[in-house]
Each structure stands twice: as C-alpha cells, then as structure tokens.
C-alpha cells in the first residue's frame, strides 16, 4: 500500500480529509469545550482526497479552528477547592486520597504481575516452538534469518531476557558465534517492544486516548525497527559491535560479580508464583538440540529436588569410547567406563494452581493467556480511570509540567538527555523494559506525558535493560562470563548506536513522526492497530524465517525486489513533497493508483463487514455489563459502551440510558457535568488535593 | 555356595579336539560371566576366553580364535569349551572361573581344573 | 595386548617380614587390576581387586595401590600359610592378561 502524502502546516478542507498525515487531524474538540452529545461523530473528517501539499486548495480551506489532536488534554478540576472545604470535607477528602493511592499501588501491582503472568503463557504457549527456532542451522550464515529468529522468539516468550540468556548459554556451548548472536540480540529488541504495544491496545475505548497511547507504544518499536535498519547493514559490513565488545571483554579482567538486584520481582514473585512456576531451562535445552526436552512440559511441577552426584558403570561398544584411557575396563565380554550421573529425587511440589492439573503446556498457556489479558485490561482500565479522578486542575498541571517542561535556555537540550538517565534508572529498578514502557503508556494515553517525552524515556528503558544484563552477565559462571558480557554488551552498545542515530538531533527522531503518523490511522481505523502489531511482528518475521529456509537465493530473489519498491515509494513521496515540479503531472500525488492502495477506507469497509456480524451478539451481552457498570458507579447516564449498542438502543423506542461515543470518555464528572446533569461543585463524587 | 565342577582329565593326540564340562551350582547361571584360563605345566596363567550364559555373547583371546568355542547350556547350568586341533604346547590345566563381582575381569570362584594332555 | 611385567619373580623371607611384590603394566590400565594367590596344585583364590579392594575373606595383611601402569602387592606380615605364587591380572582391555608370578617362599 502506497504511503499518503504528508502536507505541509497546510491543513486541507475538512470534508477533503488525508490519512496518516502525522499531526494533521482533527479530531473531536477538546473535552473540556464539550457540548451535550449523544452521536458518535468520529473526526468531523470523512471523505478522503488526496491532496498534493503545494495545492492552493490547502491554503484557502483553513478551518478557523483546529485542534492539535497531539495536544495534551485538559483535565477540568471539577472539585470543591481544599481551602472552600469544611473540617468533614478535609478529612474525608485525605482519606479517598490516601484510598485512591492505596488502589492505584494495588492496580499497578496488579499489571505488573499480570505483564509476568503474561510472560509465562506466552512461554507455555509458543516456548519450545521459540526453543526450536534456534536450533536452526542457517542462524549462523544468515544475519536476516537471526534477526527475525530473535525477534519472533522473543515474541513468543515474551521476554528479551529469555531469549537472551538462550543466545547466551549457546554461545557458551559454542553452538553459536558471538558475530550470529549480535543479530538475534538485535531481534529481540524489536520483539521486547510488543508488550506495550499490547498495553496500548488496551485503551482503544477512547479514540483520542487511543491515539496517544498507540503512538506512545509505538515510537519503541519504530526506534528498534529503524535502528536495526541501519545497523544490522552496518554491523555485517564492519562488524563494529562484535569488534568493540570484544574488545571491552578482553581488556577488563572480570572477576564474578554478584547478581543484578531483583528489585521488583521481590515484591511481584510472591503473587505470580502461586498462579504458575516454569522451568525455563527446557527452552534452552530445545534451543541447545535436547531432544529429551521436547517432551519435558514448561510447567515446574518439583520445587524442591535433591541432586545426587553419582559415577556410574556403563558400557560401551569399545575402548575407544571410554571416559578416559584410566577409566576403562573389561568383565571379559563388555567393555565398561565410568559416567557421571546426576540423579534428581523429587522432594517437595510446587504450590501453583497448575501443579496438579497434568494439563498441556498449550493448556495452561491458554487460559494464563486470557486471564493474564483480562487481568491487564482491567487493571490498566482502573489505573487509567484513578489516574484520571487524581491528576486534575492544579494536581495535572504540576504534574504535567514537571515531566513535560524543559530546562530553561541554554539547558533545554539536557532534558531529554535526562529523561534517557531517568528510563534507564526506573527501568534498572524495576528490572524490565517492557514493565516501564508499559507502565508508560497509558500516563502517555491520558495525557499525563507528551510524546517527545516518553520518547526519550523509551530511549533510556531500552538502556536500562542493557545495563540489568550487564549485571546479569558479570554474576555468570567462569565459562559463560565473557559470552554473555560480550553479548551484553552487544545489545548496550546496538541501543547507544540507535540513540546517538534517532535522538540528537530533532530533525532525525523519526520514530516520533512514524509514531505519530500510525496514532492518527489508528485512532481512525483502529482494527489497523492489530494489523500492524500482526504484520510488524509475525507476518514479516514469519515471511522472512521461510524465505531464508528456502535459501539465500530466493531470499535474495524476493527481497530485491520488495526493497527496490519501498524505496521507490519513499523517493516518489519525497519528491512529492518536497519538490513536485519534477515529477510527470501522474506522478504528483497517488491519484493514479486505485482506491485500495492509497486509502485505507475500502480495507475499512471490508473488516466491517467481517466484524458487523459479531457487533449483533456482542451488544446484547455489551448492553448487560453496561448497564451493571452503570450501578456500580451509580451513573445511570454515564454508560461506556462500544458504537454498536448504541445503534441498537436507538433502535429501540423509550430509551432511558443515554450512550456516550466512546472518544469523548473521560472521568465521570466532567462527562456529566459536559452534559449539564450535575453542578461543577459536586463535591459527592470528586474530590481535588490542591 | 557357589561350586564349579569341571569334567575329568583327557589324553588327547596332536591335531584332535577336546570339549570340557563346567558344571555350575549355588547360583543363577546366566548372571555371570564364565572365564575360561589355562596353566602350562610350571608355567603362569593364560586367558582363553569368556561367555556371558544369559545372551550367549562370546569373547575371545586372539591367539586362540578360529580354535576355541564356548558354549553355554542354560538348562543344566553347563559351561562347555571345545579346544581343536590341538598341539603339544596345549598342554595344561584348563580351569572354568566366573566373576560375582559384576562388571569386573576379576573372577572369584574357580573349578578345580581339567588337565589336557596332548601326546601322540 | 597388555604385557603385565612382575618382579620378583621369586624371593624367600622370613615369617613376620613384609613382602612387596610389583606389577608393570605396559601400558596405562587405571586401576583395573586384580591379584591372585595361588598355592601348589590347587586353583588360583581371588585376593585383591580394583587394584586395592579385598575380597570377601582376604585377611589384612593383604593390601594393592597403584594406578596407571605401577601396582603393587603388599603382605604386611608374612605368614605361614602365605606360602604361594602370587598373580597380577589387567582388566583393563580385552584380552586379560596374567603377570608371570612370584614364588613366595619362606626361608
């Protein structure tokens, strides 16, 4: 699909409407200009055309007024003031505080642990196909064939770590060269970055809180994604990374350190390993060729086990097959040696809910997988809504000018330099990358923090992670301490590399504008987020992995030609905005191409279709919980529900629970009061610290 | 307790055959391997060869392969060697043995031994 | 096959004395190695095995060491009834081998 053109600061008729055009939308006004409104009016933008940016017709059809769609939202403060409060008012307005932190902490606690139990279904689910993966020979011959091993495992188990300290102990058993690891390292960056992606997704109710969300998740992976574009070429050509670590690795004298602190997981472990415990060295042994482990299940059964050191006779069919000449002998018909055998006598069984279930591993995972999602949505759905009721009027204001203000001239460059050191500390404490950026995404989502700030946090979490396998790296044994250094420092000195090419210089950070020009095509067809998270990490990956079993040739016979079209897209669109003159009148704008592949609207016309027959059967149930919900939160006209029930209650005749359009949803409050049913002072339901 | 009852002495010409008997008792016969060794007169011990009774494998010096066979019959706990074309230096005690210590050349239980004299 | 070298081939001492007998494997053998005593016209009596484990029976005075390709046989204290010809025996490799055998006699 040919990309849309992006216009200038020319903003074109709104009936005349450019997808994708990062920053271009508009989009539904600012909720706090609000008026009473049951449609659900998407953007007032529908129709599309296709504008070339030098047309007069972008300049004359000026709206009067446009809103930033990537402006942060203003959180009205719809509460009593403190110092307007009586003593009652002041003791009952500390305790819902101090009640709203406690249920934030335990939300968030929650999502991280939900993220962990995510982590272990994934594993259940797709680990040994993961562990497989690896072993494949071509990994060491073909950069490409490990980037997107790297990348699809790490998917699959969800966690770079895993997939990192398998490259590791196969580097260590020399199965694997530091110079093939690099790429798999480089792979599993990308693929550490669809956690939030997933997070993001989670707020798809909201569509502007969608679209901030999804580009704040996003801008991770389009760093990673970019990053390697460059330096995977790079790195094959001169070998830079493999050159500079090695280099580090054998200038330093490292002696064993200690273990990287496990930070959060003291506090996470206690919950997650009570849902479920995994072994997670069967992945690695797939990984390594083991054939027994592939019938090994990933679900920890024994927790307490007593090995045994034990030399063992064996025979063997000759002399030559001994342990050692010293170690050989004969009965007079067999020849026998001494083998080491580890005997394993089970002690004590773990206490996890699967342990006594003898269910497949695909089984556990997927009902961890449901749960683990259920479990995310919901807390992050709760996160979202405290954080909403808490950062309001002056509490938002201080807050979002803390994290969003820069230093005062000349220091405002040091900033986002800053914010990279403040990723990469938050992400060391809570040991994670994924936790951090995911934990991120909704602050992005409701407004809390720009983009251009989470994307130097992104920066510094990808750093962050880097530094936890440092750690990790000097407490490894003898043999595996200069790999898995050497490895870690790969991925450090890739993540450096990356910073120093899409951050320094403003006019290089890409993955904002990437970031951004995907919110605004999710934000208006939002079942485009799922197929970018489809096709970004599996379907390409996917394509690859078979291209490069089928051999460099085809690979090579294929991927030419895919190449040479996406650059001749990427030239003609530059030409088309930068200097259009030069280009056949056919070949200004994409008009010349049909409908399909310059819009994305017949797409949207077909995915409705495929979806409109559920729509019928999910609004019966949507309209239940919707209105259980409503009880619950004692607003019988606040109901959140999805475009469909609303199509149907207004189908039906005496309709008494008025629906909302889902992307102007905010707190409760300032919907009700949007809609003039409660007074701005009602203390009942808000309560402001400030 | 563990006996081994080996057949009588022979007097055998140059070039003939003899097969010897050792008859096992006190333990289950197919555990253990069975060692056959041979004393020349005045002389040190000389490892023929071995059987494992349970599977029928066979072992065997080389010096002396192509001329000796050991057999086995699980039925009547019976070792037998067959020693052919048979020469003036063959001369000796030939002594059936089996090894309790398992998965060791070391035997421990010995039969008294069967003389083989080899005069024309 | 492995040559097993015994020296001496024969010694005479006195009752109470110790007697060391040593056995050459020709080449490393670890420590499969067995010996026998064996007395006039009787069949040869397992002694030692895996180069220093008595068998069921041995008294004391018998003791083996070595390893690789040196072992030898020690009788702490000789008595009477130790009147013999002693044997080493490699089972290290097929064929198992005999040492030549000392003549242990008493003065």
């Known amino acids: 699909m040919a990309p849309w053109p992006e216009l200038g600061d020319a903003q074109p008729n709104p009936d005349k409407y450019l997808e994708g055009a990062a920053g271009q939308q508009p989009t539904a006004p600012d909720k706090s200009k609000e008026t009473n409104k049951t449609d659900n009016t998407e953007a007032p933008v529908t129709k599309i055309e296709l504008l070339p940016s030098y047309s007069t017709a972008t300049l004359i059809d000026e709206p009067t007024e446009v809103d930033d769609p990537w402006n942060l939202p203003t959180l009205q403060d719809s509460g009593i003031k403190w110092s307007e409060r009586d003593t009652k008012g002041k003791i009952l307005c500390f305790f819902q505080g101090i009640g709203r932190l406690i249920l934030l902490l335990g939300f968030l606690y929650f999502f991280v642990c939900s993220l962990d139990i995510l982590s272990s279904a994934f594993q259940l689910v797709g680990g040994k196909m993961a562990g497989q993966f690896f072993s494949n020979s071509s990994i060491m011959s073909n950069p490409l064939l490990g980037l997107v091993i790297g990348v699809l495992v790490t998917v699959l188990v969800q966690s770079s770590s895993t997939s990192t300290s398998i490259v590791v102990s196969m580097v260590s058993s020399s199965l694997l060269t530091v110079r093939a690891a690099i790429p798999i390292i480089m792979g599993a960056n990308i693929g550490t970055s669809i956690t939030n992606t997933i997070v993001a997704l989670m707020q798809v109710g909201d569509r502007s809180e969608f679209r901030r969300a999804f580009a704040g998740a996003t801008v991770h992976d389009f760093f990673n994604w970019l990053s390697v574009l460059v330096l995977l070429p790079v790195e094959v050509a001169t070998h830079y990374l493999e050159i500079i670590t090695q280099l580090i690795v054998e200038s330093f004298h490292f002696k064993n350190g200690e273990d990287a602190p496990d930070l959060l997981k003291v506090i996470t472990k206690p919950f997650t390993k009570l849902i479920v415990q995994l072994d997670k060295k069967v992945i690695s042994q797939i990984a390594m060729n083991d054939e027994k482990a592939k019938n090994k299940s990933l679900v920890k059964i024994w927790c307490k086990t007593f090995t045994n050191k034990t030399q063992i006779n064996v025979t063997v069919p000759s002399t030559a097959n001994c342990t050692s000449p010293s170690l050989c002998w004969t009965d007079g018909i067999q020849n026998w040696t001494m083998k080491n055998v580890t005997y394993k006598e089970n002690i004590a069984k773990c206490q996890h809910i699967f342990v006594n279930f003898h269910l497949p591993d695909l089984a556990v995972g997927t009902i961890l997988l449901i749960l683990s999602l259920l479990v995310l949505c919901g807390c992050l759905i709760m996160i979202v809504k405290i954080l909403g009721s808490v950062l309001k009027g002056q509490v938002a204001t201080v807050i979002k000018k803390t994290i969003n203000t820069d230093f005062p001239f000349p220091f405002a460059w040091l900033t986002g330099y800053l914010a990279i050191l403040v990723g990469a500390g938050m992400t060391f404490i809570v040991q994670s990358s994924s936790v951090f950026t995911s934990a991120l995404t909704p602050l992005i989502g409701i407004g809390v923090i720009t983009i251009e700030r989470a994307y130097p946090l992104t920066l510094g979490s990808n750093i962050g992670t880097t530094t936890t396998a440092i750690l990790a790296a000097l407490a490894s044994p003898g043999n595996a301490l200069r790999s898995s250094l050497q490895i870690a420092l790969c991925h450090f000195f890739f993540n450096i590399s990356g910073i120093l090419l899409w951050y320094p210089i403003p006019f290089t950070r890409l993955p904002i504008r990437m970031a951004k020009g995907l919110g605004n095509i999710s934000a208006k067809y939002r079942w485009f987020a799922v197929f970018y998270l489809i096709i970004f990490f599996f379907l390409i990956p996917l394509t690859v992995f078979g291209l490069s079993l089928a051999g460099w040739r085809v690979l090579v016979g294929v991927g030419v030609p895919v190449v040479f079209i996406i650059i001749l897209v990427l030239c003609l669109r530059l030409l088309q905005s930068r200097c259009p003159r030069v280009l056949p009148k056919k070949l200004q704008n994409w008009n010349f191409l049909p409908l399909w592949m310059r819009s994305l609207k017949p797409w949207d016309a077909v995915v409705s279709k495929f979806t409109g027959c559920f729509q019928m059967r999910c609004c019966c149930c949507c309209r239940v919980c919707c209105r259980a919900c409503c009880l619950l939160c004692d607003c019988p006209k606040c109901c959140r529900c999805s475009k469909c029930c609303e199509d149907l209650e207004e189908a039906q005749e005496g309709q008494d629970v008025p629906v909302k359009a889902p992307e102007t949803f905010d707190n409760i409050t300032i919907s009700r009061e949007a809609q003039g049913e409660v007074p701005a002072s009602d203390s009942k339901t808000e309560c402001t610290a400030l | 307790q563990v006996q081994l009852v080996q057949s009588g002495a022979e007097v055998v010409k140059p070039g003939a055959s003899v097969k010897m008997s050792c008859k096992t008792s006190g333990y289950t016969f197919i555990t253990y391997n069975m060692h056959w060794v041979r004393q020349a007169p005045g002389q040190g011990l000389e490892w023929i060869g071995a059987i494992y009774p349970g599977s029928g494998d066979t072992s065997y010096n080389q010096k002396f392969k192509g001329r000796v066979t050991l057999t086995a019959d699980k039925s009547t706990s019976t070792a037998y060697m067959e020693l052919s074309s048979l020469r003036s230096e063959d001369t000796a005690v030939y002594y059936c043995s089996i090894s309790t210590i398992i998965t060791t050349g070391a035997v421990d239980y010995w039969g008294q031994g069967t003389l083989v004299t080899v005069s024309s | 096959d492995i040559q097993m070298t015994q020296s001496p081939s024969s010694l005479s001492t006195s009752v109470g004395d110790r007697v060391t007998i040593t056995c050459k494997a020709s080449q490393d053998v670890g420590t499969a190695v067995a010996w026998y005593q064996q007395k006039p016209g009787k069949s040869p009596k397992l002694l030692i095995y895996?180069?220093?484990t008595r068998h069921t029976g041995v008294p004391s005075r018998f003791s083996g060491s070595g390893s690789g390709t040196d072992f030898t046989l020690i009788i702490s204290s000789l008595q009477p009834e130790d009147v013999a010809t002693y044997y080493c025996?490699?089972?290290?490799?097929?064929?198992?081998?005999f040492g030549g055998g000392t003549k242990v006699e008493i003065k």
């Open positions: 025996q490699q089972y290290s490799r097929i064929p198992l081998t």
């Open positions: 895996w180069t220093s």
